[in-house]
């Protein structure tokens, strides 16, 4: 048998018990709330900061590219790869055919103003993609030059020049004074490269890395 | 609905369920305690067993530091 | 941690909390029921009050369709 308690003590005990239980309830609910808040707010902030980053990234490009065309990369909603709207995309790069006729130096500067470079062609597949967008009766500057006139060809983006991945027309390059490269069409050999004088105005192809946001 | 959205909805449901259940549990716990007290008053502790049992249940929620 | 991962972890926490509390609640409910039965046997329904109260608690969890 439990010894008889005073009703007063029992009331007091009950009151303490209720306080303990409700305190626990409050603590539990608070913990739940913290969990829930973290679950809701952190991702929201995460998304928000990501959006802010994206916007600032977009703002960087906006002065040159008022609009971008973006596609979702893979399944993740986070990763979008974009190219400026009139540009075409292939693999991890964007391409722009400049129809204005300019010297090689001016063409390169024109590309760099847009955050790009004159095109560097690394593979046959890349060249095959590029030529789909070119006109047969035009020539286009590549990002390839020989500033010393000593046949030390160099790409504008510092990619090493690899003799095995070049697409010169037969007999080209053929003139030490011609220090810049173009891509053009010859009926006998289709599309290929040719060395020409750099100041002679040509159309050009700009290439830039895709913008990931 | 996207995967993440679904996750947040589930979060909300579980959160509400957790709150409701916490409140119900505490309410029941207090009812049991009150009932135990009433039982003492009315029949000299017929429910001693129940009382102890409640204590056990309480122990499971009470978080004490293990002895050093 | 990435955004979705965080959501899933919190889901798991809330889910476990819900399960533990559900089990505790059911255990307590069963104790109360047992206690109520014992009370009838020993003292002819001293705990009618408690029984009704439990019923109320049960009502809040029982989900009935509203009348058409």
């Amino acid at each position: 048998m439990v010894p008889e308690e005073e009703p007063q003590d029992r009331e007091k005990g009950l009151w303490w018990f209720q306080l303990k239980v409700w305190s626990m309830a409050v603590v539990s609910i608070l913990l739940l709330s913290v969990c829930f808040t973290v679950s809701s707010v952190v991702p929201h902030n995460f998304m928000y900061s990501k959006t802010v980053k994206r916007l600032s990234k977009l703002r960087e490009y906006q002065q040159y590219h008022p609009s971008l065309t973006c596609v979702m990369e893979g399944k993740d909603i986070e990763d979008w790869s974009c190219c400026p709207t009139p540009w075409t995309s292939f693999q991890s790069s964007c391409y722009f055919i400049s129809t204005g006729m300019q010297s090689w130096t001016k063409s390169q500067k024109n590309c760099s103003v847009m955050g790009a470079d004159l095109v560097v062609i690394n593979t046959r597949e890349e060249q095959d993609f590029i030529i789909q967008n070119l006109k047969r009766n035009s020539s286009y500057f590549l990002g390839l030059s020989d500033p010393g006139g000593r046949r030390h060809w160099q790409w504008v983006d510092q990619t090493p020049y690899n003799e095995n991945v070049t697409f010169w027309h037969s007999g080209e390059p053929n003139n030490l004074d011609e220090r810049c490269a173009i891509i053009n069409f010859r009926s006998s050999e289709e599309w290929g490269w040719n060395d020409i004088h750099c100041h002679v105005p040509q159309k050009s192809i700009c290439k830039m890395k895709k913008i990931y946001i | 609905l996207g995967e993440p959205q679904l996750c947040y909805i589930l979060d909300a449901i579980l959160f509400l369920y957790g709150i409701v259940l916490t409140l119900l549990y505490c309410r029941l716990k207090i009812q049991v305690r009150k009932a135990a007290i009433t039982s003492y008053e009315k029949s000299d502790g017929v429910y001693t067993g129940l009382s102890t049992r409640n204590q056990e249940t309480y122990e499971t929620l009470k978080h004490e530091k293990p002895p050093q | 941690l990435g955004e979705p991962q965080l959501c899933y972890i919190l889901d798991a926490i809330l889910f476990l909390y819900g399960i533990v509390l559900t089990l505790l609640y059911c255990r307590l409910k069963i104790q109360v029921r047992k206690a109520a039965i014992t009370s009838y046997e020993k003292s002819d329904g001293v705990y009618t009050g408690l029984s009704t109260r439990n019923q109320e608690t049960y009502e809040t969890l029982k989900h009935e369709k509203p009348p058409q």
Epitope: D117, P147, Q154, D177, C180 | - | -
Partner: antibody, heavy 119, light 111 residues
Framework: DVQLQESGPGLVKPSQSLSLTCSVT?????????WNWIRQFPGNKLEWMGY???????NYNPSLKDRFSITRDTSKNQFFLKLNSVTTEDTATYYC????????????WGQGTSVTVSS | DIVLTQSPASLAVSLGQRATISCRAS??????????IHWYQQKPGQPPKLLIY???NLESGVPARFSGSGSETDFTLNIHPVEEEDAATYFC?????????FGGGTKLEIK
């Protein structure tokens, strides 16, 4: 080896026109390169004036506005400078020079001709 | 126009020592690896002579004691070891942007 030789009056009166000739030997001006005029003021300051390229296109220093022009005579393998409305500030040694197409370095210079603008 | 500032305006170096001449551009004259700056040597009564093109490439016939370096806006011409015949005025020139411009010159004397 290529050789460039400037010729023209050593003294010009203010407001008159200055005309200079550059005769090139050892290389055809229609075959390649840029053919430049550069002047050096007393005190050694050098100023690029402009060029005419092997294909006849030209490029002038905007600071000379419309006072300056370059022409050529491929049959004589010569190119010419004409500077209108000269002032005393145009007193300088005038060089004709061959420029590399790219990167636009001046790889061959004439000996230069001294021009004084004075009344 | 791009302004090229050379320093010092003059310097005297002992025979066999190193001479260093600086050329600073008011804006970048680099196109990636290609730094469109060139160095000339001018001796009294003679026209300038090309020494180095594209910042670091030695023109044929120029002795290997001449070397150039730099990128973007800061470029340097080094002569080591300095010889008697190197007494001259040295100019830098940029061809990155029209109009092409020259530095003010650095007069090198041999002690």
């Amino acid at each position: 080896d290529v050789q460039l030789q400037e010729s023209g009056p050593g003294l010009v009166k203010p407001s008159q026109s200055l005309s200079l000739t550059c005769s090139v030997t050892g290389y055809s001006i229609a075959s390649g390169y840029y053919w430049n005029w550069i002047r050096q003021f007393p005190g050694n300051k050098l100023e690029w004036m402009g060029y005419i390229s092997f294909d006849g296109t030209y490029n002038y220093n905007p600071s000379l506005k419309d006072r300056f022009s370059i022409t050529r005579d491929t049959s004589k393998n010569q190119f010419f400078l004409k500077l209108n409305s000269v002032t005393t500030e145009d007193t300088a040694t005038y060089y004709c020079a061959r420029g590399v197409d790219y990167p636009n370095a001046i790889d061959w210079w004439g000996q230069g001709t001294s021009v004084t603008v004075s009344s | 126009d791009i302004v090229l500032t050379q320093s010092p305006a003059s310097l005297a170096v002992s025979l066999g020592q190193r001479a260093t001449i600086s050329c600073r551009a008011s804006e970048s004259v680099s196109m990636h690896v290609t730094h469109l700056i060139h160095w000339y040597q001018q001796k009294p009564g003679q026209p300038p002579k090309l020494l180095i093109y594209v910042a670091s490439n030695l023109e044929s016939g120029v002795p290997a004691r001449f070397s150039g370096s730099g990128s973007e806006t800061d470029f340097t011409l080094n002569i080591h070891p300095v010889e008697e015949e190197d007494a001259a005025t040295y100019f830098c020139q940029q061809s990155f942007e029209d109009p092409w411009t020259f530095g003010g010159g650095t007069k090198l004397e041999i002690k």
